[in-house]
């Protein structure tokens, strides 16, 4: 655990960033699914 | 925090700098270098954070390098040229609840043929 | 990356007074600034972090202000001890924004 306050937030940065690419990963996951079944 | 390898080199001859942790972990802290030319101010090269990512002024990149090991950060300095001739600073980050920084009292880079 | 300009370059003051030093980001920072006091041949004391948090063991006499793009440290009741160069540094969103400092402000006391 850090207490540093340049990790703090781009530890936040970080997160977002990992939840955006999880995100994108599946919606293109559906999306390719959804032109598949087409 | 404790700076070395600051010595007079020739323009052009790489440098690589030492900069020794005790007391916390790098695993937890970020750690950055900065640089003061004689009777000059602070500038900021760069960073590297607990996760060994590392970003650097706009003026710094392709220019230096830093990297790290368990108790150790380096600054390394490619090709230098006399403009680099200073005080090479190594500093931990700032804590929120600890309030307060860890700074090296530097070491000097001269540059010069 | 986010430029900080510092004003001004040198100000002296008496024994007891007060020194306005100014900061101003290039750019919205939000309140990610710090202020370092720095006397010769020593490293930088961090003073203020957060824009306006006083870090540890520093005087009350110290107080920051601000945020956005501008920023004020305020030295009041002056004391011999107080004469350095102080240096505000950016830290917001380093990675895109680099973590520029000002170009300082030497202070004298008389």
């Known amino acids: 655990h850090s207490d540093g306050i340049f990790t703090d937030s781009y530890s936040r940065y970080r997160k977002q960033m990992a939840v955006k690419k999880y995100l994108a990963a599946v919606l293109g996951k559906r999306y390719k699914q959804r032109v598949k079944n087409k | 925090v404790e700076e070395s390898g600051g010595r007079l080199v020739t323009p052009g001859t790489p440098l690589t700098l030492t900069c020794t942790v005790s007391g916390f972990s790098l695993s937890s802290y970020a750690m950055i270098w900065v640089r003061q030319a004689p009777g000059k101010g602070l500038e900021w090269i760069g960073i590297i954070y607990d996760n060994g990512d590392t970003y650097y002024a706009s003026w710094a990149k392709g220019r230096f390098t830093i990297s790290k090991t368990s108790t150790t950060v380096y600054l390394k300095i490619a090709s230098p040229t006399t403009e680099d001739t200073a005080t090479y600073f190594c500093a931990r980050e700032p804590g929120s609840t600890t309030q307060n920084d860890l700074w090296g009292q530097g070491t000097l880079v001269t540059v010069s043929s | 990356d986010v430029v900080m300009t510092q004003t001004p370059a040198s100000v002296s003051e008496p024994v007891g007074g007060t020194v306005t030093i100014k900061c101003q980001a290039s750019e919205n920072i939000y309140n990610s600034l710090l202020w370092y006091q720095q006397k010769p041949g020593q490293p930088p004391k961090l003073l203020i972090y957060?824009?306006?948090t006083l870090a540890s063991g520093v005087s009350s006499r110290f107080k920051g202000s601000g945020s956005g793009t501008e920023f004020t440290l305020t030295i009041s009741d002056l004391e011999c001890a107080d004469a350095a160069t102080y240096y505000c540094?950016?830290?917001?969103?380093?990675?895109?924004?680099?973590?520029?400092f000002g170009g300082g402000t030497e202070v004298v006391v008389k």
């Open positions: 957060r824009a306006s």
């Open positions: 540094q950016n830290y917001y969103n380093i990675w895109t924004n680099g973590a520029a």
